[in-house]
């Protein structure tokens, strides 16, 4: 029997300080640019080396950004989302959703030598 792929979804508040070259990441998504089918959310598509986000270390490519400085990113056009980040000020608070892939082993099978408990 094949293993099952599950996802562990967690949320985190990330506070970034805008660096000399900005926040240092790219986004995709929006109501006019759906990156994930049936989801117009905003996703991180790229973290730039040595940028503020990379140096902080918590934001990851593939994360969904739920809000910026408390402002919800639901139902926004792509460019409106971009503008929201660009006008977010020096200290930027991001509410993000991490989606971690968890590979479960074959169901009902125990490898040789596994504890039987």
């Amino acid at each position: 029997m094949n293993g099952r792929v599950d996802y562990l979804v967690t949320e985190e508040e990330i506070n970034l300080t805008r660096g000399p070259s900005g926040l240092g990441f790219n986004i995709v998504g929006g109501t006019d640019q759906q990156y994930v089918s049936n989801d117009s959310g905003i996703y991180v598509s790229r973290i730039k080396e040595n940028g503020a986000a990379a140096l902080d270390g918590r934001l990851q490519e593939g994360d969904k950004i739920l809000s910026v400085n408390g402002q919800d990113l639901k139902n926004l056009l792509h460019q409106d989302a971009v503008d929201l980040f660009r006008n977010a000020g020096y200290a930027v608070s991001l509410r993000v959703q991490h989606r971690l892939q968890v590979q479960n082993g074959p169901i009902g099978h125990r490898g040789e030598g596994d504890p039987s408990g």
Epitope: S21, G22, L23, G24, F25, N26, I27, V28, Q33, Y35, V44, S45, R46, K48, H78, Q79, V82, F85, R86
Partner: nanobody, 125 residues
Framework: EVQLVESGGGLVQAGGSLRLSCTAS????????MGWFRQAPGKEREFVAH??????YYADSVKGRFTISRDNAKNTMYLQMNSLKPEDTAVYYC?????????????????????WGQGTQVTVS
Amino acid sequence: EVQLVESGGGLVQAGGSLRLSCTASGRTFSTYTMGWFRQAPGKEREFVAHISWSSTYYADSVKGRFTISRDNAKNTMYLQMNSLKPEDTAVYYCAVAIGSPVDSYRHRDPLEYDYWGQGTQVTVS
């Protein structure tokens, strides 16, 4: 991995026109931020033009003469070059970044782009 293939370069007389094309692989082409750069012999690579989801930008040296555009259905970006001058002679490269930068005015920096084409030679005599 995104593959980029440029075409359309060639030899043209001053005052003439060329249209460069850059075709990219990948199902999410519409989310790409794209740019054209050029490099003349013995010079650094320089920004020419950029197109994002909703904006276009140009180097001052090509404003009014060059037009950048894209066709998302064909996974292709174009650079229409009119009124060409000898100083436009260079190898022209297309470049792609995945998504839109959340930081302003970063499009001139080659480090902003993730993938590059092999280049196409434009010679204006």
